[in-house]
Amino acid sequence: SIPWNLERITPPRYRADEYQPPDGGSLVEVYLLDTSIQSDHREIEGRVMVTDFENVPEEDGTRFHRQASKCDSHGTHLAGVVSGRDAGVAKGASMRSLRVLNCQGKGTVSGTLIGLEFIRKSQLVQPVGPLVVLLPLAGGYSRVLNAACQRLARAGVVLVTAAGNFRDDACLYSPASAPEVITVGATNAQDQPVTLGTLGTNFGRCVDLFAPGEDIIGASSDCSTCFVSQSGTSQAAAHVAGIAAMMLSAEPELTLAELRQRLIHFSAKDVINEAWFPEDQRVLTPNLVAALPPSTHGAGWQLFCRTVWSAHSGPTRMATAVARCAPDEELLSCSSFSRSGKRRGERMEAQGGKLVCRAHNAFGGEGVYAIARCCLLPQANCSVHTAPPAEASMGTRVHCHQQGHVLTGCSSHWEVEDLGTHKPPVLRPRGQPNQCVGHREASIHASCCHAPGLECKVKEHGIPAPQEQVTVACEEGWTLTGCSALPGTSHVLGAYAVDNTCVVRSRDVSTTGSTSEGAVTAVAICCRSRHLAQASQELQ
Amino acid sequence: QEDEDGDYEELVLALRSEEDGLAEAPEHGTTATFHRCAKDPWRLPGTYVVVLKEETHLSQSERTARRLQAQAARRGYLTKILHVFHGLLPGFLVKMSGDLLELALKLPHVDYIEEDSSVFAQ
């Protein structure tokens, strides 16, 4: 008897006949930048403060008739989804609304910028608890809007935005494309991507996760007790803003990086039918549907990691692609992927005092992606150890030689265009888990980290026959930090992490002979932090 | 999500102009860029966000805005400063003719200029 969307985001332990998870986000203030709202609606009365901020363009058309209930429709519904008494996610959260969209749901980048500035000034004048800013809007890619979002995020504000309803790559829109913003796509009751007329939810690497966004029951501005069903990535973003408010209310000290990692960690995995997305976007789009954590505390022991894909490098011979982690995250490994299989590997390198993951295209290649594994590892000291190409037939090796440092990832990068085409695979010597092994023509990069209580192990899964995909997963309690293919298999397109599974992709098996050249081995590095586990036990 | 990778249109305008001389040129070695929305129907020409370099103070932003107005007036153009940004990004919002972009890009402290564009409820 509860709306499907509230049931979907609620972990089974809370699922009674009613939706009443502990603590409704009461320590958090959620700012909504949208249309005007009907603040005396039963769902949100006394919960939403309408600020005096208004920056909207004139409505289009000479015969436009301003009808209050229509002007308030979008914003009222979203305020209800976030904090509504009866159909809201974070029933205890208080909200503030800023009007940046007119009665036709249209606004400007400049108006949105001024709104974000207003929030920052309010925060400085009267610092409160954690702030969440919901941006249920989208425009074309905007450097300035993304920059403003970045600044606000670095001031400690959590920004949540709609991925967009254009059935397109979310990276082409703002603020969806801003890395610091939590970008949300929409799914329906069947956990499928939402179709909206001829369009639908946006997708791609700029989407962080999906959330319920079709037939969402919420406050209707038609009357003070009315409800209506609405659909869109705005509704999905409102769910995540509500979940974020709940999480921050339970743990007010959470940073943006920690919150994002938890949102990803507690999401339902691999439930979306990826066939809905364009083929080239499937690998880039996260198969995650947001959910509340099963308990508000005790997640701290976990080593959280996420996968960050770069933009496509483009096809030029020397093209590179760079994937970056957030400021509070550690880059624990770096891999690369190319649909054509023509790539020159990847390397971790310092840029502006921080490690980044850079992938290199090869001659004749259609371009590459760099894939960073970004983790939360407090008090970590990580460095990259590089071994230049070796002359020995055994291949290139590098290990973590510093005391207390453990291997979290391996990368290899080569200058020659057709590395390993006619060479047998190089096998990793057993009993040397702290070591990266690669082609003798390749330089090998080991990511070595020291952090209290950090322990890692290598897990391999090899398939002798040609296979389009080989996977290896870390077991319960361990987190995947590194993912690579055992060198020597020239038809490998690349390796990347999906949640806790290392995926190694190869060319279509029909084009590969069944010689030893067809053998594929996926190598996962799985880590855990005893220190985080102990700290968590001490808290409880 | 990469800030610098987006399918937006970037026009780098040449900064050679005898009229303004070197005194008006931005700090050497840097080229201010102009950006606009790749989706044509969403563009709002005539309104521009002038973004200044990161450490620019409010007083410098106001001075730069006034300077743009004065130089535009000398050329017979009317401009209106709609808002001066500070707190998040230094800069200002200006209503002006697109003819003045080349001039605006040469102003001191200018990092880039973006033409205003529409956003929509999703």
């Epitope: 008897s1 509860i2 709306p3 006949d17 009613e18 939706y19 009443q20 005396d40 209930s69 008494r85 009866d86 159909a87 029933k91 029951i217 038609d222 009357c223 003070s224 007790t225 009315c226 409800f227 069903s229 | -």
Partner: antibody, heavy 126, light 106 residues
Framework: QLQLQESGPGLVKPSETLSLTCTVS??????????WGWIRQPPGKGLEWIGS???????YYNPSLKSRVTISVDTSKNQFSLKLSSVTAADTAVYYC??????????????????WGQGTLVTVSS | EIVLTQSPATLSLSPGERATLSCRAS??????LAWYQQKPGQAPRLLIY???NRATGIPARFSGSGSGTDFTLTISSLEPEDFAVYYC????????FGGGTKVEIK
């Protein structure tokens, strides 16, 4: 078939607090489909909505009475209650309880008061 | 607050006649208006909701019309049990009731 029954003292002294309880039978008060409301009718006059409550405890009140009204719910007893403080003779009325569809579950029916209890007369007098 | 004004205050008609009751709102209530019937010593009973929809078990002789600010309840042919007081109620903005129209036997 759902029935509502009001109960409570028929006489209250001025400045005291009026307390009434509505017992719901033939259905659960814990359904997310409904709100439960109080309406009153002074003798020979029209109807006035006082306030409503949801099973979760969320309430909303008539702005003109808000400062004096408290509505609470006890799902274990399938009851909801009304407290009206600082009463005067003007609060003398027949007090009704009624069910109202919340609108959260659209299939539950129209968003109006139906059914009603039979009402209880409360007189404010010293 | 939205004020509902009902007219006439009293309507004197004979059984079999047509009754037309009016309810006017001080501002638009869209179609968020209901009609209730109340007999002496009884609780009100929902007749019409959302301006024109008959509630369950209500005879077809009762019909509602109107939207915005002007609404009408029509009883096509009065039966003896229809003589009662009729109230309109809006829910566009919270809940308010009209003052009532008494339909009495002529």
């Amino acid at each position: 078939q759902l029935q509502l029954q009001e109960s409570g003292p028929g006489l209250v002294k001025p400045s005291e607090t009026l307390s009434l309880t509505c017992t719901v039978s033939g259905g659960s008060i814990s359904s997310s489909s409904y709100y439960w409301g109080w309406i009153r009718q002074p003798p020979g006059k029209g109807l006035e909505w006082i306030g409503s409550i949801y099973y979760s405890g969320s309430t909303y009140y008539n702005p003109s009475l808000k400062s004096r009204v408290t509505i609470s719910v006890d799902t274990s007893k399938n009851q909801f209650s009304l407290k009206l403080s600082s009463v005067t003779a003007a609060d003398t009325a027949v007090y009704y309880c009624a069910r109202e569809n919340s609108g959260v579950v659209p299939a539950a029916g129209p968003n109006w008061f139906d059914p009603w209890g039979q009402g209880t007369l409360v007189t404010v007098s010293s | 607050e939205i004020v509902l004004t009902q007219s006439p205050a009293t309507l004197s008609l004979s059984p079999g006649e047509r009754a037309t009751l009016s309810c006017r709102a001080s501002q638009s209530v869209s179609s968020y208006l209901a009609w209730y019937q109340q007999k002496p010593g009884q609780a009100p009973r929902l007749l019409i909701y959302d301006a024109s929809n008959r509630a369950t078990g209500i005879p077809a002789r009762f019909s509602g019309s109107g939207s915005g600010t002007d609404f009408t309840l029509t009883i096509s042919s009065l039966e003896p049990e229809d003589f009662a007081v009729y109230y309109c109620q809006q829910r566009r903005n919270w809940f308010t009731f009209g003052g009532g129209t008494k339909v009495e036997i002529k």
